[in-house]
């Protein structure tokens, strides 16, 4: 039995930032889990960790070059994902695992969403710039 | 919840070898993270060596780049310290710790569990 994982298909980071909502056919109260984000079509970058369990504080945990943090719903795990660079978009897919109570459940892979981080482009000043008022 | 067991410290004279090994028993994931951590008299707790679970990331202090080796024994949910060339400076308390982050981690928040720590004595 595998948990199934719904996933925008597409996320464009206009200011570096972005959240992405990992929505699961599977109820997390009162579970240990471990909800991880990957990136890359191989999936081979883990880049963000979230791991609850019943009696303690959400553990966020972000890998050297991603600043992340996350958030818990019923049935789903958001990871916000800030100060993103331009060479950071790419394809990010959802992982979730449950390991208590029995018996342990991951999910089917999903779709991915591609994450499109858009450059800050600064105005930039005119060549000719208006009179000056008085 | 996760125990952590380390066994393999002791006393050698500079230049010597040690292995430590630390074991790892609980609920464990598909990924996470063990590493090595050391602390001298009077000093901070200070970041050895890490590898994750699937053995494709690893990372190393400065200090022992070329010296030390970290691996694992994924059957036995068990990492190695292998600890070449010793020093002086060497001589710590080391202590092994686990972490749901699924790459080797050198920040020592990261870490949830700890071993009780074994003792490495580097002798002139």
């Known amino acids: 039995n595998k948990i199934l994982v719904k996933q925008s298909p597409m996320l464009v980071a206009y200011d570096n930032a972005v959240n992405l909502s990992c929505k699961y056919s599977y109820n997390l109260f009162s579970r240990e889990f471990r909800a991880s984000l990957h990136k890359g079509l191989d999936s081979a970058v883990e880049v963000c960790v979230v791991y609850g369990n019943y009696s303690q504080q959400l553990q966020v945990y972000s890998k050297t070059g991603f600043n992340c943090d996350g958030k818990l719903g019923n049935e789903s795990v958001t990871f916000y994902l800030q100060n993103l660079y331009v060479n950071q978009t790419d394809i990010y897919f959802c992982k979730i695992e449950v390991m208590y109570p029995p018996p342990y459940l991951d999910n089917e892979k999903s779709n991915g969403t591609i994450i499109h981080v858009k450059g800050k482009h600064l105005c930039p000043s005119p060549l000719f710039p208006g009179p000056s008022k008085p | 919840e996760v125990q952590l067991v380390e066994s393999g410290g002791g006393e050698v004279q500079t230049g010597g070898s040690l292995r430590l090994s630390c074991a790892a028993s609980g609920r464990m994931f598909s990924n996470y993270a063990m590493g090595w951590f050391r602390q001298a008299p009077g000093k901070e707790r200070e970041f050895v060596a890490a590898i994750n679970y699937r053995r494709d990331d690893a990372d190393y202090a400065e200090s022992v780049k070329g010296r030390f080796t970290i691996s694992r024994d994924n059957a036995k949910n068990t990492v190695y310290l292998q600890m070449n060339s010793l020093r002086a400076e060497d001589t710590a308390v080391y202590y092994c710790?686990?972490?749901?982050?699924?790459?080797?981690?050198?920040?020592?928040?990261?870490?949830?569990?700890w071993g009780q720590g074994t003792l490495v004595t580097v002798k002139p």
């Open positions: 710790g686990f972490t749901y982050a699924g790459w080797a981690s050198s920040r020592r928040d990261d870490y949830n569990y």
